[in-house]
């Protein structure tokens, strides 16, 4: 504690100019005062002035009024500072002395003589109001007032509460009369060191370092930090929780980067071909006859479909083709024969059957041969039966497809799941994507294959309520609560049917 006992001397009357011993002062009583302040005593005794003492210079002769003076020698009121808790009681001894010596430092002069003394004992509360008193004896009268006030930055009824107004990192406050803190606008807390964030700033997702601010924690955005940020890799998606990637309409894939309506948006298929929103690139072109290529952009030779039968040779012309027929055949495609079974037209052991009363014939071919005259060895690969880039190989009476890595099946039509070899560690969930498997990791793990144990597991603190399951999702710093039936909220903290602001008590 810290305070000041103040004594204001107002008037001293010693009309006859007498000393306490009955002698008179020559030429008059040149008066100064000694003040001794000590702890309360029922009977005032000599001894140290435990609360302080002070002397004045000569203030006047015999009778005089003491004027207020704020500085220098002869200051009035007199100041008796203390640095302890004010006890509320005191003893005060005021002595009037005559000095024949120095006006300014009479205390040091020899031959000083006592004029009179008064003793006051009692209680005194801290306060600004002066207590006024007057003491008389046979020869003298003293008028005075006194009070106890607290030093700067000290407050309370015993000046024991320290409070210094501040506006810095450690607090933002002024001091009340009782010494309690009064926070400056925008600040709160015991020491007024907590800023009051922007009204509506989300309690969990936002924070502030100064008033009316709302700074979002990772994964959140917006004025009130109540809107999530999608995943870093997300292209055409949004989120309902941080780092999610929920695809906009028409987009698919883990990062919503696969155009589900590629055909409509980009029209990649040329020359009247049909576009389907499927396949490894997000679309497939089905070409009209006479065209080939990924986008049906390449025109085929008119002879590419082998239109000439019976061994006829094909010649390309500007917008069509021409068949040169071998001996015994005629027609646009060499489809008519001048031969009969008598000419033994069937090769490779084919059987000849007469038609149209012997004017024409038909050959029945043995296995592995074909053509009007059984002249062609069957090539089972001509129909391109192998899908997904598989290689077709003739094996005697049959053919096989040699599949590229990642495909299987008779026609290489089946995609081998990358997930079949269980690449995800620690119970991660595997998703097959075009560029390989992607693992969604359980709480506590991350990495491409869930191989990294997360030291700061967001789920470790058990943030989900009401029996919800916690997942770390796509980012190890954030968690997702999977709510049981009947509960909603980012932490499953609200029962269904109650507004999110309703303080639910289980």
């Amino acid at each position: 504690g810290s305070g000041i006992f103040q004594l204001r001397l107002q008037e001293f009357v010693n009309q006859r100019g007498m000393l306490a011993n009955g002698q008179s002062c020559e030429p008059g009583c040149r008066t100064f005062f000694r003040i001794c302040l000590k702890h309360f005593q029922a009977t005032f005794s000599e001894g140290p002035c435990t609360f302080g003492n002070v002397s004045t210079p000569v203030l006047g002769t015999n009778s005089f009024v003491v004027r207020d003076k704020n500085s220098g020698s002869g200051r009035n009121p007199l100041q008796l500072p203390f640095n302890f808790t004010w006890p509320g009681t005191f003893s005060l001894n005021i002595q009037a002395w005559h000095t024949p010596g120095d006006d300014l430092r009479p205390e040091t002069s020899p031959g000083n003589s006592l004029i009179s003394q008064i003793i006051i004992q009692g209680s005194l509360a801290v306060g600004k109001i002066w207590r006024t008193d007057e003491q008389n004896d046979t020869l003298t009268r003293l008028s005075y007032s006194y009070r106890v006030i607290c030093s700067d930055n000290y407050y309370g009824e015993s000046c024991s509460r320290l409070c210094k107004k501040r506006d810095d990192h450690f607090g933002h406050y002024e001091c009340q009369p009782d010494g309690s803190l009064s926070c400056l606008p925008g600040w709160t807390g015991k020491y007024c060191d907590q800023p009051i964030c922007l009204s509506g700033c989300h309690e969990q997702n936002g924070y502030c370092s100064k008033p009316d601010e709302c700074i979002c924690r990772p994964g959140w955005q917006g004025r009130l930090c109540n809107e999530c940020i999608p995943h870093n890799g997300c292209r055409h998606g949004t989120c309902s929780i941080p780092w999610q990637c929920a695809c906009d309409e028409g987009w698919g894939g883990l990062f919503c980067d696969q155009d589900l309506n590629y055909c409509t948006h980009h029209s990649p298929c040329k020359n009247g071909s049909t576009c389907s929103n499927s396949g490894p690139k997000g679309y497939t072109c089905t070409c009209l006859p006479g065209y080939t290529g990924e986008h049906c952009e390449l025109g085929l030779s008119k002879c590419a479909s082998n239109p000439c039968r019976n061994g006829g040779s094909c010649k390309d012309q500007e917008n069509s083709y021409h068949c040169l027929c071998p001996p015994g055949y005629y027609g646009q495609h060499c489809e008519h024969s001048t031969l009969t079974c008598a000419d033994s037209p069937c090769f490779n052991g084919g059987s000849c059957r007469e038609r149209n009363q012997g004017s024409s014939y038909a050959c029945e071919c043995p296995p592995n041969f074909t053509g009007s005259n059984c002249e062609k060895k069957v090539d089972r690969c001509t129909s391109n039966p192998c899908a997904n880039g598989g290689q077709c190989q003739n094996r005697g009476p049959s053919r096989t497809c040699r599949c590229r890595p990642g495909f299987t099946g008779t026609h290489c039509e089946l995609h081998i799941s990358d997930c079949a070899r269980s690449p995800c560690a620690h119970g991660g969930t595997c998703h097959d994507l075009e560029n390989g498997p992607v693992c969604t990791c359980p709480a506590g793990f991350s990495g491409r294959r869930c191989e990294v144990r997360i030291t700061h597991d967001a789920c470790a603190s058990g943030p989900c309520f009401n029996g919800a399951t916690c997942y770390t999702g796509l980012s190890p710093n954030n968690f997702v609560c999977n709510c049981p039936y009947g509960f909603v909220g980012s932490r499953c903290e609200f029962p269904v049917g109650l507004p999110p602001s309703f303080p639910w008590v289980a």
Partner: antibody
């Protein structure tokens, strides 16, 4: 493919103004917060400003507050940085980036050079 | 503001070497740390986010580790295209701040 293309850089006198633009493609621009990051010649990277996707809330580094304004036009898939009262210390390559102040900057433009000199 | 300090500021290495760059934060930033690669005259490119997650299309020779205040970027077997400047960045506290960079040069 995500693309961010900045424009509008150039030489300007101290106290002058410039407006940088960033054209975005390859992603749904309106779904994502955006930022400007700068790099003084031969120096490191320094975040400048951010704008949210949801409500257009803006944040600035202290040294540019009151002088720079970040804005966006979702209909045009464009981000802007209006720079007023330019100082010599604002000289830098300014990059447009996808991200907020509390998320990584996942995609960056090629940058546009702003030189403030008399 | 949080200070990010990278070390070393530069280092020389050979193709095939294993290289480690460290980044220290002046206070706890949990796992909210990213690493970027920048080649001369080019824009930075995100390599790693959330301390240890590889960004899309980044080779698996890059990896990140750490938490709290100390973080590491490791390149397991240096390739010719990896010679560049690398920056770390924290996004846990406002404002976001970057390290001063580490220049990786060919020996």
């Amino acid at each position: 493919e995500v693309q961010l293309v900045e424009s509008g850089g150039g030489l300007v006198q101290p106290g002058g103004s410039l407006r940088l633009s960033c054209a975005a493609s390859g992603f749904t621009f309106s779904n994502f917060p955006m930022a400007w990051v700068r790099q003084a010649p031969g120096k490191g990277l320094e975040w400048v400003a951010t704008i949210s996707s949801s409500d257009g809330t803006t944040y600035y580094r202290d040294s540019v507050k009151g002088r720079f304004t970040i804005s966006r036009d979702n209909a045009k898939n464009s981000l802007y940085l209006q720079m007023n009262s330019l100082r010599a210390e604002d000289t830098a390559v300014y990059y447009c980036a996808r991200g907020y102040y509390n998320s990584p900057f996942a995609y960056w433009g090629q940058g546009t050079l702003v030189t403030v000199s008399s | 503001d949080i200070q990010m300090t990278q070390s070393p500021s530069s280092l020389s290495a050979s193709v095939g070497d294993r290289v480690t760059i460290t980044c220290r934060a002046s206070e706890d930033i949990y796992s909210n740390l990213a690493w970027y690669q920048q080649k001369p005259g080019k824009a930075p490119k995100l390599l790693i986010y959330d301390t240890n997650n590889l960004a899309d299309g980044v080779p698996s020779r890059f990896s990140g580790s750490g938490s709290g205040t100390d973080f590491t970027l490791t390149i397991s077997s240096l390739q010719p295209e990896d010679f560049a400047t690398y920056y770390c960045q924290q996004y846990n506290n406002y404002p976001p701040t970057f390290g001063q960079g580490t220049k990786l040069e060919i020996k």
